[in-house]
């Protein structure tokens, strides 16, 4: 960018004068002129003259920032536009406002929904332009300073522009460009085009900017590559350039973007859940736990706004209290806590559970698991721990219909010292009227009653849910409330469980592991037969399959297990869907006797149900992302179901589906994913390309390069990225491989003269520019070009220095003859 | 037969409001992507709104030129379409077409479509 | 957004002669499953537009095969081999790859 003459101002307060463009480069040959060959500037020579400082008494200054009480003055600028342009613009990030005829972004407001994204968030076109101010002096000593707050949502940081005479002529840079974006978000970079030289550096630092936050360094120089993308976690990002000497690489171009952030998915607390509104600011997280046990912490949490969007407080958790009094208690659990912990491993848990007045408890007994020489569980019937005991786990069998107090309030006491064998405790409390019975309790069942308030006379008829069976089994399945003086059962509660086998003839049923949910036992050989109308057929949805190593699920497409063998599942699996030919399907599951294989084990949950044996194939999921078209309007063999997905996304499988013979589809049904690969960029002509990775997904890289005597025009390598809107791009547009030209070689410095910064060779378009010692005059070509072709020539011969007949200094300069 | 009919066209004023509406039969209405383009008088065709199928969720997707001025909807019990276009502009003047997915794409079949004049 | 740009914007054509209209899209339109999201229309004059092509060289339901589509990547061609009366309009080129969907500014085919 060149200088006019009124950007050069002295230092407010220094003596200097102003000076223009011209006179500085004057100033500088000047100091060269008064060097003979004497002072070691001799041709070939590698030193760089444009480090030489000015004479004693020559200094000469470029203003620092202006001041808001200075609008006259303005350093060397350049403006950086969202779209890369570069151009003349305003400059002083301290300005209070913009000179006439500029915009400035406003600054961040807390009150503004986000920064503003470009046409691709849906917004229309804005282009503000952003300012990279460069601040020159040529004092050797004093860097050049080129720093700029940005507050765009999206745009390009460029190098200092070196093609000013001054940028030519001076020294050190020490240049920091701040992006600084609205809380909430982050800033993703892609390193555009990069080329420094090993003296200079780079540094990309997420943060900062806040009282007590310092920023954490991403990455230097060694670390960058052209095409690599780099976020910041935080809504600040500073990249820090220096060069201790002219910069002599090409420079550096990084393109940056806003991107939303958003709290993490807050873990679910053991023995409770989470459900959350939405992880972006504002969102909130309301966690709750399992019956009987409590939050520890806060019950609700909220995604907050800032630098980097956090929760407003630690995840609570759910504890199984040792122990406590539950006033007015209606319905609830007693469960025992985690061994270990907090508790340690000896405990010695009492919980106290009052009624209301005139109420009585019941105490259903759910799971337990005490080791026989180090826990023990006892229940008294009543408040304290000298009232009677009415359960005690040394001397007694688990009641199967649970337990009744006589008074209003039950003491359990539960002693563990350093268990064998892991400790477990569920008990399900109840209160009740004492003129009535206690409601019963099915697990994985229902009750149905004949009086809500069970009264004495009152029926309760018992029936499981499907894949359970009643526990004793057969009638009766239903118990009677006796005795108005003290009412009370006639028969123990049943219990509902998975069974080893057994028939189903429903149209629709689960087949459940034995002893499902807990863990199946070693030593099973379970068969289920499944019947459904002799005209249907059954569909079986395999939901939960998680079998132990060894052991195994085999379906037979029949009845019995001398039919044809439909599927054998094992171990952990996924979910699927069988069809069997005809109305019956047999299940047989073997688990070998001895200890337990290692492995899950926990069991499975299969689903089935009858359908009709019309000669179609199952019915199929619709497709998200996108939509299928079917040849017929039913599934009958031969239909065909063409899948398709809608923009921004991919078929990932068969796009099309066949019904075949055997009514099972060709193929499993595809599904749409978001697109997250870049299309190929193409070859290159005169060139070869080195890809990271087959497919081209986002992050990958694609590195072009040229034959020998072809040179590389753009970037040299390709990032994939992904956005937000629309599919994955490449960072830049495919380069070319543009046949080199042969540089000019150096045509030799005349006698009594010298050339500026003398190199060997000379590529095509660039120019050398001689001068003659003092005494001399220049005949010919002050200055002359490499014209490019094979082989690349110079325009002219270099000029001769012959001794001039005067001495006015104006002439060596202007090289007249 | 697929069948697609829009009406509500007509003349507005700038700042003005107006309804489109879409009559589909043939088809399960609820099974189908519907979208909305438009034609500028002796110009092109420019996509203009777009609504999901029952399996996804009905959500909706806007070109940026009309993106919080109008609104796309469907009445599912009606087999109906609509475009609410509110704070109508000049360049608003279109024949707009109502448009539904299929075997080939999202835009297989279309309607014969309305014209809506933005004029003062 | 995908800039769809088509060339020529009008092409004089004798029946009974070959006609070729390109489409180039600025981001290439292939992917990974091996399909170009890419559609012709043709719409007669006071007619809605009608599907001839898609994913770039499949023919519509009911398309004679004297329509036939062709290309790579970002440039596409529409061939007419030989044209009939019932051609002629404005040929749309139209891409599906991503929100928002962009169609070309079309290609007038009119009788010499």
């Known amino acids: 960018l060149p200088l006019k003459e009124e950007e050069i101002l002295p230092e407010p307060g220094s003596e200097t004068p102003t000076v223009a463009s011209e006179a500085l480069a004057e100033l500088l040959h000047g100091a060269l002129l008064r060097r003979g060959p004497e002072m070691g500037y001799l041709p070939g020579s590698d030193r760089d003259p444009t480090l030489a400082t000015p004479p004693a008494g020559q200094t000469l200054a470029v203003p620092s920032l202006p001041r808001a009480t200075e609008p006259g003055t303005g350093p060397l600028t350049t403006a950086v536009t969202p779209n890369g342009v570069r151009g003349a613009g305003p400059t002083a990030p301290e300005l209070l406002t913009p000179p006439p005829g500029t915009t400035a972004p406003p600054p961040p407001s807390p009150a503004s929904p986000g920064p503003p994204l470009g046409p691709e968030g849906g917004e229309e076109e804005t282009t503000t332009t952003i300012i990279t101010t460069t601040t020159v002096t040529t004092t050797v000593t004093s860097p050049v300073l080129c720093n700029n707050n940005i507050s765009e949502g999206e745009g390009y940081v460029e190098s200092p522009d070196l093609g000013s005479p001054v940028s030519r002529t001076l020294g050190l840079l020490d240049c920091t460009y701040s992006i600084h974006v609205y809380p909430g978000y982050g800033i993703e970079i892609q390193v555009q085009t990069l080329n420094l030289s090993q003296e200079e550096e780079l540094l990309v630092l997420a943060g900062g900017g806040s009282p007590g936050l310092a920023p954490r360094l991403l990455a230097n120089s060694s670390m960058l590559g052209e095409g690599q993308v780099l976020r910041s976690p935080t809504n600040r990002l500073l990249l820090h350039f220096q060069s201790p000497r002219v910069p002599r690489g090409g420079g550096f171009r990084i393109h940056y973007q806003a991107y939303l952030l958003s709290c993490g998915f807050p873990p679910r607390p053991a023995h409770g859940d989470v459900s959350v509104t939405d992880l972006h600011p504002g969102g909130t997280a309301t966690f709750h736990c399992d019956s009987g046990y409590q939050l520890q912490g806060e019950e609700t949490l909220i995604c907050l706004n800032g630098t980097r969007p956090s929760w407003n407080g630690e995840t609570p958790s759910c504890m199984a209290s040792c122990g406590g009094t539950i006033h007015n208690a209606t319905l609830g659990r007693i469960v025992s806590p985690e061994p270990g912990g907090a508790v340690g491993p000896n405990l010695t848990c009492r919980w106290v559970i009052e009624a209301a007045e005139g109420r009585r408890l019941h105490l259903h007994f759910e799971r337990v698991s005490l080791d026989e020489d180090n826990d023990r569980l006892m229940v008294r019937s009543g408040g304290s721990p000298l009232s009677p005991v009415i359960y005690d786990s040394d001397m007694d069998d688990v009641p199967e219909r649970g337990l009744i107090s006589d008074a209003q309030s039950l003491y359990v006491e539960l002693l563990s010292e350093t268990p064998a064998n892991p400790l477990l405790l569920s008990l399900r409390f109840e209160a009740f009227e004492e003129d009535r019975c206690f409601a019963p309790f099915l697990a994985h069942g229902n009750v149905t009653t004949t009086d809500p308030e069970y009264r004495p006379g009152a029926l309760a008829t018992f029936s499981c849910l499907p894949g359970y069976a009643l526990e004793p089994p057969g009638p009766p399945n239903a118990i009677e409330c006796v005795d108005p003086t003290e009412p009370h059962w006639n028969d123990t509660e049943p219990a509902c469980k998975a069974m080893c086998g057994g028939e189903l003839s429903e149209p629709a049923g689960v087949v459940l592991s034995p002893d499902w949910p807990q863990s199946y036992s070693p030593g099973q050989d379970c068969v289920w037969g499944v019947h459904v109308q002799e005209e249907k057929r059954i569909l079986l949805q395999v939901e939960i399959l998680n079998v132990r190593e060894g052991d195994m699920l085999t379906l037979f497409d029949g009845d019995g297990p001398s039919a044809r063998v439909l599927a054998q599942l094992r171990g952990p699996q996924p979910r699927r869907r069988l069809l069997s030919s005809g109305p019956d399907l047999t299940l047989q599951f073997q688990a070998p006797p001895g200890p337990p294989n290692p492995g899950l084990g926990q069991g499975f949950v299969l689903h089935f149900k009858e359908v009709p044996r019309n000669d179609t194939c199952p019915e199929l999921p619709p497709p998200e992302w996108g939509w299928r078209t079917a040849s017929h309007g039913d599934l009958i063999r031969g239909t065909v179901l063409t899948y398709q997905c809608e923009p921004g996304y991919e078929l990932l499988g068969s796009d099309i589906l066949t019904c075949q013979w055997d009514l099972s589809w060709s193929a499993a049904p595809p599904a749409c994913q978001k697109i997250m690969t870049c299309a190929d960029p193409g070859e290159i002509a005169n060139g070869h390309r080195t890809a990271s990775d087959a497919g081209f997904p986002v992050g990958s890289h694609v590195q072009y390069r040229c034959l020998p005597g072809y040179s590389l025009e753009g970037a040299a390598m390709l990032t994939c990225y992904s956005r937000d809107t629309g599919t994955p791009k490449w960072s830049d547009r495919v380069p070319k491989c543009a046949l080199k030209y042969e540089p000019c070689l150096n045509p030799g410095v005349p006698e009594n003269g010298y050339q500026t910064l003398y190199k060997h060779h000379y590529q095509a378009g660039e120019s050398l520019r001689f001068f003659c010692y003092e005494g001399f005059e220049l005949i010919g070509e002050v200055t002359i070009t490499c014209v490019p072709g094979h082989p690349s020539q110079w325009t002219s011969q270099p000029p001769l220095c012959k001794v001039t007949q005067t001495t006015d200094p104006s002439r060596q300069l202007e090289g007249g003859n | 037969e697929v069948q697609l009919v829009e009406s509500g066209g007509g003349l507005v004023q700038p700042g003005g409001s107006l309804r489109l509406s879409c009559a589909a039969s043939?088809?399960?209405?609820?099974?189908?992507?519907m979208s909305w383009v438009r034609q500028a008088p002796g110009k092109g065709l420019e996509w203009v709104a777009l609504?999901?199928?029952?399996?996804?969720?009905?959500?909706?997707e806007y070109s940026a030129s009309v993106k919080g001025r109008f609104t796309i909807s469907r009445d599912n019990s009606k087999n109906s379409l609509y475009l609410q276009m509110n704070s109508l502009r000049a360049e608003d003047t279109a024949v707009y077409y109502c448009?539904?997915?299929?075997?080939?794409?999202?835009?297989?079949?279309w309607g014969q479509g309305t014209l809506v004049t933005v004029s003062s | 957004d995908i800039v769809m740009t088509q060339t020529p914007l009008s092409i004089p054509v004798t029946p009974g002669e070959p006609a070729s209209i390109s489409c180039r899209s600025s981001?290439?339109?292939?992917?990974?499953?091996?399909?170009?999201?890419l559609y012709w229309y043709l719409q007669k004059p006071g007619q809605s537009p009608q599907l001839l092509i898609y994913?770039?060289?499949n023919l519509a339901s009911g398309v004679p095969d004297r329509f036939s589509g062709s290309g790579s990547g970002t440039d596409f061609t529409l061939k007419i081999s030989r044209v009939e009366a019932e051609d002629f309009g404005v040929y749309y080129c139209?891409?599906?790859?991503?929100?928002?969907?962009?169609f070309g500014a079309g290609t007038k085919v009119e009788i010499k």
């Open positions: 981001t290439s339109l292939l992917e990974s499953s091996g399909k170009h999201r």
């Open positions: 609504i999901r199928n029952k399996a996804n969720g009905y959500t909706t």
């Open positions: 139209m891409q599906s790859l991503e929100y928002p969907l962009t």
């Open positions: 994913y770039m060289s």
């Open positions: 448009a539904r997915n299929g075997l080939y794409g999202l835009f297989a079949y």
């Open positions: 043939g088809f399960t209405f609820t099974d189908y992507y």
